[in-house]
């Protein structure tokens, strides 16, 4: 069949028909439905929601909708033995205890099964000792403490403020510094925007609000007990001592009311500079320990959470492609939430639901996409991207041969200022072209395109007249598809104004106050931003699944490769003497990038000219585009991170959320001046340049004429 026969609607109306079917009112209705009770991974409530979504996707018209279950390691507080932190006096009496749960929001006082704030996968323990305040617990914060201030965290309980980097990196850093416990808290400087009331009167974090979250350092492994393989019925599971990424010291999160009581007594060293001060009325002394009158008091943690192998459920829906059913475009987002999930994830899940409904409507009218579209409602994302990773592990052979693209669909909003997109460079042109066709929802941009408002509010730092598009990092379900399997990936959501709002994420992230009302009252009353995100995500899926030639532009990869090579070279050039001494050269990398640029340019020319009516040649060209992302995968993975296999991008070793370019070289160069064996360290830099240069050259050759 030709693609026109397959689709049954003339091509120019396909996208419009799909987009016109998306309705803000439906997204609102779905969000309400998904947020009335908690849907914590591994619970009966989340299983029931999985079955509901399965049933509704079938009604919407998908060809098949299946549940895919796995038995993975999860973590829960002990219901009868709550977690808390105490200040104890010299007699061991508890003179202050942190809260056991968040004050429930209005209207939710009688909801059961609200999990109290906890750090998922914390080991049990009751350490006591002096407190050290470590700012954000970033790598550079510990450098400041240990190297400049000569403060030793060994045997201390550290208290760190949330923000800037993934909490798992904070815990890893604290462990490496010798701490015996970690307290995480939300400082108003990061989670309370000036001039806005706290929930329920506004979108700011109240003093009793607490951010939940996992503290794993999985590095892409998925289920900690079955790295590399699906946690199925016949899985071999590691012992807990060999599990991947588990923290070794107790960790617990608190709100700023409780943090005030701990921090107000801090003595020892003054904060090194103003960047260590938050907004509480406390001195932000670093410690160790309490001041004068309180110097005999200590802090004690009481952590009793348990790790349990628990069944989780993904929902996988299929809309079979009419022409290339063996090519998969995937739209996936998670379903599990810490509590109500008003933003994370259900603002995303509601959008996916409406996208499925719209595709289903077109299918019922006789249309089919050219390629197969897979829709996924992932489970246990909050516990380490477990549902998506286990499914990808189970289906890795199919995915690496057939995966065209993955579009992520977690939270649709983290603000209501402008669009935010992170994606592979292959998708830059797709995103630009699509947003030029969509209407902006922003005030003051009536009648203007989304591209225009986005570019105005979030301009590219490199290219004038273009919007900022960021690198993919991790911390979400695209990780396994992009970083491990090399499937072109992207994500889009509406975000805040990062210039004026410097707080981290959105204030109520992972708290009990992330409710339907938060979204409906304060973020998006008309659900117009949700609709725009549905149009962007859905539009990307539509184009990827339906365009005759895949909407990937390999020339954009060439541009960023040059930029990344320049950047890593300039980092290395901070050590000119060592580069000379150890004969470190980037020539091979720059040569490979040059070759890639030339070959990509020629490929693009051929792409314009080839006979698109020849299905064999069309398939060949499309396969070269599809497999280009795959060509950046090193089967051996990055050093000590075997599941991060993409040579161009990986999550930063210092912040899982952030993407790092040429991560192998970057990590080899990081803090190289402190390495005990410089010859070995610079040898590793050279090896990583070699790996990067080879990979770029090899990828370029996949775009060469095949014979």
């Amino acid at each position: 069949k030709s693609s026109n026969e397959a689709t049954n609607i003339t091509p120019k109306h396909n996208m419009k028909a799909f987009l016109d079917e998306l309705k803000a009112e439906n997204i609102k209705k779905f969000l309400y439905n998904f947020t009335q009770i908690p849907h914590l991974a591994g619970t009966e409530q989340n299983f029931q929601l999985a079955k509901q979504i399965q049933s509704q996707w079938k009604e919407f018209g998908l060809d098949s909708v299946e549940l895919a279950h796995y038995d993975v390691l999860l973590s829960y507080p002990n219901k009868t033995h709550p977690n808390y932190i105490s200040i104890i006096n010299e007699d061991g009496n508890e003179i202050f205890n942190t809260s056991l749960f968040e004050p429930p929001p209005p209207g939710y006082e009688n909801v059961s099964d609200i999990v109290p704030p906890f750090s998922a996968f914390s080991p049990q323990g009751m350490p006591e000792g002096d407190l050290v305040y470590v700012n954000y617990a970033r790598t550079e914060d510990f450098f400041k403490l240990e190297r400049d201030m000569k403060i030793n965290c060994s045997g201390k309980i550290v208290i760190a403020r949330y923000g800037k980097v993934f909490r798992g990196n904070k815990v890893k850093n604290a462990q490496l510094a010798g701490a015996k416990g970690v307290i995480l808290y939300s400082d108003p400087a990061d989670y309370f925007a000036p001039g806005v009331k706290s929930y329920p009167d506004g979108w700011n974090l109240p003093g009793g609000g607490v951010q939940r979250g996992n503290i794993l350092n999985l590095n892409g492994a998925g289920d900690p007990l079955t790295p590399g393989y699906p946690a199925n019925e016949y899985a071999y599971r590691r012992g807990i001592a060999e599990a991947v990424g588990l923290p070794s010291i107790p960790v617990h999160p608190i709100g700023y009311y409780d943090a005030q009581k701990l921090l107000e007594k801090m003595g020892g060293s003054a904060p090194p500079d103003s960047s260590w001060r938050g907004s509480l009325k406390v001195p932000y002394n670093v410690g160790p320990g309490f001041t004068g009158n309180f110097s005999t008091q200590k802090v004690k943690m009481h952590i009793h959470s348990t790790n349990e192998v628990t069944r989780i459920y993904n929902v996988i829906g299929t809309l079979r492609g009419a022409v290339e059913p063996d090519r998969y475009v995937i739209l996936g987002g998670h379903r599990d939430s810490w509590v109500f999930g008003g933003i994370d994830p259900q603002s995303g899940a509601a959008v996916v639901h409406e996208i499925v409904r719209s595709f289903g409507t077109l299918k019922k009218e006789g249309w089919r996409p050219r390629r197969t579209i897979l829709f996924a409602s992932w489970d246990a994302e909050e516990f380490g991207l477990l549902g998506s990773t286990e499914w990808a592990e189970e289906n890795s052979r199919l995915l690496q041969e057939r995966g065209v693209a993955y579009i992520n669909a977690d939270s649709s909003i983290e603000g209501n200022y402008t669009l935010r997109v992170d994606c592979t460079p292959l998708m830059y042109s797709l995103v630009h072209n699509l947003t030029k066709e969509l209407k902006s929802p922003d005030e003051g941009f009536e009648g203007k395109s989304l591209y225009e408002s986005w570019t105005k509010k979030s301009p590219s730092p490199e290219f004038s007249g273009m919007p900022r598009i960021s690198k993919l990092g991790s911390g979400n379900d695209f990780e396994v598809f992009f970083q491990r399997l090399g499937i072109a990936s992207g994500r889009a959501r509406y975000t805040k104004n990062w210039e004026t709002n410097k707080f981290s994420g959105y204030p109520l992230y992972h708290s009990v106050y992330e409710t339907y009302e938060l979204v409906e009252k304060f973020y998006d009353p008309m659900f117009k931003y949700h609709l725009t995100v549905a149009q962007v995500r859905g539009g990307m899926v539509f184009e990827l699944a339906n365009s005759i030639v895949l909407p990937f532009d390999c020339r954009d990869y060439a541009v960023v490769l040059r930029k990344y090579a320049d950047k890593i070279y300039s980092i290395s050039m901070k050590h000119p003497q060592e580069m000379k001494t150890y004969s470190v050269s980037f020539d091979s990398l720059f040569s490979a990038v040059k070759n890639f640029t030339e070959i990509a340019s020629k490929f693009s020319e051929r792409l314009q000219d080839f006979d698109k009516s020849n299905p064999i040649v069309l398939r060949m060209m499309n396969d070269q585009l599809m497999f280009l992302e795959r060509a950046f995968i090193d089967p051996l993975g990055l050093p000590d991170r075997p599941f991060y296999r993409h040579v161009i991008y990986a999550p930063s070793s210092h912040n899982k959320y952030a993407g790092e370019s040429f991560p192998g070289i970057y990590d080899a160069l990081f803090d190289i001046e402190s390495k005990v064996d410089p010859s070995k360290a610079w040898g590793e830099v050279k090896r990583q340049i070699y790996v990067a240069a080879f990979t770029v050259q090899a990828a370029a050759e996949t775009l060469s004429e095949v014979a």
Partner: antibody, heavy 123, light 107 residues
């Protein structure tokens, strides 16, 4: 409407025990700190004890420490005061009072009071 | 523990007079101070929190001030229904002690 109703008062001999209850209605009990305050005949107000909204912290006046225990059951919208080793000087009207809604305040006064229940300790 | 003292212990004033009661804490309590009114035979009534914020429904002739250790409650124009004993209370740190009270009546 918002209401606190104390019960459990009465006449008791020195050294014996008594348990006071305070039933709350008309508000989200699980968000509020709760206090007990007493007033001896012809005297001023004396703060007795407080319990945090979630029971995480309990504080007592020195005069009752080790003898009285404050507790709460959020599922029953009720707070309690277990009074052991009672003394003649514990004779008073005992008021249940609502403290701060922890969703809004960490520190707050007592904005709603019950009518009080009388405890008389006498041989 | 923080001790609270009040002065005067009692006062008489005429209707329409401006009346000021002082409360002192033995150590700084920031602005974590509340004022209560108790009429004879009645339950105490919450007037002011955070030293100066009027509880809703309290007449505007009542005002509070101060911070740290020294606080005041002022009735700008004394009314017959203001005859009562007034108590200050520390709620900065436990024990949340009350002052001994100031009895206000009309001459």
């Amino acid at each position: 409407q918002v209401q606190l109703v104390e019960s459990g008062g009465g006449v008791v001999q020195p050294g014996r025990s008594l348990r006071l209850s305070c039933a709350a209605s008309g508000f989200a009990f699980s968000r509020y700190g709760m206090h007990w305050v007493r007033q001896a005949p012809g005297k001023g107000l004396e703060w007795v004890a407080v319990i945090w909204y979630d029971g995480s912290n309990k504080y007592y006046a020195d005069s009752v420490k080790g003898r009285f225990t404050i507790s709460r059951d959020n599922s029953k919208n009720t707070q309690y005061l277990q009074m052991n080793s009672l003394r003649a000087e514990d004779t008073a009207v005992y008021y249940c009072a609502r403290g701060g809604d922890f969703l809004y305040y960490y520190y707050y006064g007592m904005d709603v009071w019950g009518q009080g229940t009388t405890v008389t300790v006498s041989s | 523990d923080i001790q609270m003292t009040q002065s005067p212990s009692s006062l008489s004033a005429s209707v329409g007079d401006r009346v000021t009661i002082t409360c002192r804490a033995s150590q700084g309590i920031s602005n974590y101070l509340a004022w209560y009114q108790q009429k004879t035979g009645k339950v105490p009534k919450f007037l002011i929190y955070e030293a100066s914020t009027l509880q809703s429904g309290v007449p505007s002739r009542f005002s509070g001030g101060g911070s740290g250790t020294d606080f005041t409650l002022t009735i700008s124009s004394l009314q017959p229904e203001d005859v009562a004993t007034y108590y200050c209370q520390n709620y900065n740190s436990a024990p949340f002690t009350f002052g001994p009270g100031t009895k206000v009546d009309i001459k």
